[in-house]
């Protein structure tokens, strides 16, 4: 039995995978910040995790996926206020009892030191200094990402 959050992220991922081609993104759009091969958009408004996920989708992007600790640190360096929290694309899968990225992969336990509980209806946020488990219904800011690719590319599930 999938939770509504799991269903929502799976639906969004499937609809993204139906697209076979899209123009490569040479530069980050206005208001987006470049971080290596990604463009990031830090929201100024707040939303629960589900709504944040949907908002990124409407922007033809996804909630932020973080590959490793190095990328986490570089992303955190872009956060100006230490007290502000941002949703990323990671939530607790009740069926698998594990943290799951919205692209379907599981969290490598060494990548992020999560503070807070790992349980149903928990989603992950980051601040300037830490990574927190929060109730998914909490209204905080969020980070969308677009991959920066210089050529036309086939679209596969994000990894």
């Amino acid at each position: 039995q999938k939770s509504s959050i799991e269903k929502c992220s799976v639906d969004i991922q499937q609809s993204r995978n139906k697209t076979t081609e899209r123009p490569g993104l040479l530069n980050c759009p206005i208001y987006w910040q470049q971080l290596r091969e990604k463009c990031l958009l830090f929201s100024h408004t707040v939303n629960p995790w589900n709504n944040s996920l949907a908002d990124c989708s409407t922007k033809e992007s996804s909630l932020l996926l973080i590959r490793d600790k190095d990328e986490l640190i570089h992303t955190q360096n872009l956060i100006r206020d230490k007290a502000i929290l941002f949703w990323i694309g990671l939530n607790f899968s009740l069926s698998e009892k594990n943290w799951k990225w919205i692209n379907g992969s599981f969290l490598n336990s060494n990548d992020l030191e999560i503070r807070g509980d790992a349980k149903e209806n928990s989603c992950i946020s980051i601040s300037q200094t830490s990574v927190y488990s929060e109730y998914c219904s909490t209204e905080i800011r969020w980070i969308c990402q677009k991959e920066l690719t210089p050529v036309r590319n086939k679209v596969y599930p994000d990894s």
Epitope: R115, S133, T138
Partner: antibody, heavy 119, light 107 residues
């Protein structure tokens, strides 16, 4: 079940010492900041001390130099060493957990342990 | 240190009344504010976190609002079990500070 259980309270003379303990269970103790909060009879809540996940400690001026907070992650235990106790330290002492974020800030409290400083 | 000024310190109200309790922070605390309910001889119980998020199991008659420095706890229709003392807490920065409490009594 997530639980915090305090112990170590009692009657002590002014100038004396007492060590409070807080035993945690049901959660990953090491990933939480921990706090001591006290409440004198008929009074409000007063924050007493905190210890971060890295062992960093915090105190208000009223107890600085007299109280020492510590933690033992392997035993999921929190401690408060109270020295040079005064009548004004008489209160129920609670331990509470705090993730540092929003959802789990001061969300779980122990049942409290009574400290009475009197001659 | 951030001071939390809670008002009123006490109030008398009747069952069914709408009750509002305010907490004012001496400086901005974002939404790092929680509200607690405490009954005599009992442990404080968190009702609201992140200024306006209602905890699971807490009746919907409780609501929180505000941001920055001004925060309000509202009970839309006071019930007999709501007579208690309410505290706000800021945990935006050390030291965490509580409001002095508001005792809601039966009129």
């Amino acid at each position: 079940e997530v639980q915090l259980v305090e112990s170590g309270g009692g009657l002590v003379q002014p100038g004396g010492s007492l060590r409070l303990s807080c035993a945690a269970s049901g959660f990953t103790f090491s990933s939480y900041d921990m706090h001591w909060v006290r409440q004198a009879t008929g009074k409000g809540l007063e924050w007493v001390s905190a210890i971060g996940t890295a062992g960093d400690t915090y105190y208000p001026g009223s107890v600085k130099g007299r109280f020492t907070i510590s933690r033992e992650n392997a035993k999921s235990s929190l401690y408060l060493q109270m020295n040079s106790l005064r009548a004004g330290d008489t209160a129920v002492y609670y331990c509470a957990r705090d993730s540092g974020g929003l959802s789990y800030a001061f969300d779980i409290w122990g049942q409290g342990t009574m400290v009475t400083v009197s001659s | 240190d951030i001071q939390m000024t809670q008002s009123p310190s006490a109030m008398s109200a009747s069952v069914g009344d709408r009750v509002a309790i305010t907490c004012r922070a001496s400086q901005g605390i974002n939404n790092y504010l929680a509200w607690f309910q405490q009954k005599p001889g009992k442990v404080p119980k968190r009702l609201i976190y992140a200024a306006s998020s209602l905890l699971s199991g807490v009746p919907s008659r409780f609501s929180g609002s505000g941001s920055g420095t001004e925060f309000t706890l509202t009970i839309s229709s006071l019930q007999p079990e709501d007579f208690a003392t309410y505290y706000c807490l800021q945990h935006n920065s050390y030291p965490p500070t509580f409001g002095q409490g508001t005792k809601v009594e039966i009129k």
